[in-house]
């Protein structure tokens, strides 16, 4: 019970981890203009991975894409990439995990196949959180050391006696919901890998029985199933004794003592 | 329609005080900030102060900080300007102005009111 | 504070004929995030309040006439007649709605040779 609930949890958490990796990836207010201490304009401005915001007095919002590739800062480009490859394989993870639910039964799958899926699905969600949390404290620190170049030099020259505004950006509201959400992710991806554990049935150890076949003596020792990989040393049509006699195809399902659905 | 109307301008000695009202119609007053803006006679126009549809943001000119109080009812759709110590060159028509949806422009002027400041 | 500094002070023009005055901002109006000039054009004629002309630096508000054009970025702003009427006799005044405390330009004085 303890291990479907472990995994059902690591699979919601995961979910929801997810969903605010993707709500801040998308999300305008990466960055917001710093009211304090800055010219006072009649405009607010944020910034997010894909586009510029301008908000005025009024509450009329306008928006702008970025719309070069090669323009853009190589640590804007890099935060992209990693929020996308944390979305992209969290995803998977997801896709994978719902099919490692204990709850969810798929034609025959043995708990072995279910424990590597949820060990996969969890190790995902893990490097999903982690490419989340690198994605936004990247750009966090770009913030802060953008933040006190700009606190240096308030007014930037523009030759002559003219000047222009050096508009200073401060923490927006993305990067604490990715923050969070990648720190959901990664102790949902623990949680699957924890729940992973208990859903590996015990090595199960068969002790070699001879038998007299008519024209030669061989004894057949069979390759126990290794709970780690799902896969056995055993061929099809071999035969396994373990007190009757059964080929594989026979071998029937019993529930294992972590078993309660 | 949008209408702006100022009244309680008139003469006042120098060092006294002076309460102007806007009284607004035509459109939702609650949704716009609102600005005061000036004009000598003869002189260009001046900026006085801005106030947020919400009351959350306040601004003034530096030549009336600390003497002039803008506020709004929005319930009565009435803007104030509260002027205090007043000088002699506060003398100016007192425009009611409301602040632009786009570009922060400001878009629809009342007729304005008369301030004379004299001794 | 931003200072604001329209040329030429007055011109005399004849009717139809093309004019343009200038507006110059001690500081860029420029807003990056959503490529706007915060710079607004108003017109007084005598006896009556200002009235909004153009906004964003070369939006017309509407029910201007097309004769009005607003053009410029940064720190220099132009605002052009097309073709003068004897109805535009009036002042023009430039505005900073970029950075508190909004600033007027003195102002250009049009008016009919």
């Known amino acids: 019970m303890a291990v479907t609930a472990c995994q059902g949890l690591g699979f919601v958490v995961s979910l929801i981890g997810i969903a605010g990796i993707i709500a801040a990836t998308c999300m305008d207010q990466w960055s917001t203009q710093d009211l304090y201490n800055n010219p006072v304009t009649a405009v607010f401005n944020y910034q997010g991975l894909w586009r510029s915001c301008v908000r005025e007095s009024s509450g009329f919002t306008e928006c702008r894409g970025y719309f070069t590739l090669l323009g853009l800062p190589a640590m804007l480009q890099a935060v992209r990439a990693l929020m996308i490859v944390g979305i992209v394989l969290g995803a998977i993870g997801l896709l994978v995990s719902i099919f490692a639910l204990k709850c969810i039964r798929i034609g025959s799958m043995e708990d072995s196949a279910k424990a590597n899926m949820t060990l996969t699905s969890g190790i995902m969600f893990i490097v999903s959180g982690l490419c989340a949390i690198a994605g936004v404290s990247v750009f966090a620190n770009m913030l802060v050391t953008n933040f006190w170049m700009s606190t240096a030099n308030m007014y930037t020259g523009m030759g002559g006696m003219v000047q222009t505004v050096q508009t200073r950006y401060t923490f927006g509201a993305a990067l604490f919901v990715g923050w969070v959400a990648g720190g959901l992710t990664l102790i949902g991806g623990v949680m699957m890998c924890i729940a992973c554990r208990g859903l590996a049935p015990e090595e199960t150890n068969y002790k070699a029985v001879s038998y007299h076949a008519s024209g030669h003596s061989v004894a057949y020792k069979p390759g126990g199933f290794k709970a780690s990989t799902g896969f056995g040393s055993n061929t099809k049509n071999k035969k396994i004794y373990d007190g009757g006699a059964r080929t594989e195809d026979e071998v029937q399902s019993y529930p294992s003592k972590h078993d309660y659905v | 329609e949008v209408q702006l109307v100022e009244s309680g301008g008139g003469l006042v000695q120098p060092g006294g005080s002076l309460r102007l009202s806007c009284a607004v119609s035509?459109?939702?007053?609650?949704?716009?900030?609102m600005h005061w803006v000036r004009q000598a006679p003869g002189k260009g126009l001046e900026w006085v102060a801005y106030?947020?549809?919400?009351?959350?943001?306040?601004y003034y000119a530096d030549s009336v900080k600390g003497r002039f109080t803008v506020s709004r009812d929005n319930a009565k759709n009435s803007l104030y300007l509260q002027m205090n110590s007043l000088r002699a060159e506060d003398t100016a028509v007192y425009y009611c102005v409301r602040s632009g949806y786009y570009g922060s422009s400001l878009d629809y002027w009342g007729q304005g009111t008369l301030v004379t400041v004299s001794s | 504070d931003i200072v604001m500094t329209q040329s030429p002070d007055s011109l005399a023009v004849s009717l139809g004929e093309r004019v343009t005055m200038n507006c110059k901002s001690s500081?860029?109006?420029?807003?990056?995030?959503?490529?706007?000039?915060?710079l607004t054009w108003y017109q007084q004629k005598p006896g009556q309040p200002p009235k909004l002309l153009i906004y964003?630096?070369?939006t017309r508000e509407s029910g201007v006439p097309d004769r009005f054009s607003g053009s410029g970025s940064g720190t220099d702003f132009t605002l052009t007649i097309s073709s003068v009427q004897a109805e535009d006799v009036a002042v023009y005044y430039c505005?900073?709605?970029?950075?508190?405390?909004?600033?007027f330009g003195q102002g250009t004085k049009l008016e009919i040779k």
């Open positions: 964003w630096a070369s």
């Open positions: 106030i947020s549809s919400g009351t959350t943001n306040i």
């Open positions: 035509g459109f939702t007053f609650s949704s716009f900030g």
């Open positions: 505005q900073n709605v970029y950075i508190y405390p909004l600033t």
């Open positions: 500081q860029s109006l420029f807003q990056s995030g959503n490529q706007r000039n915060y």
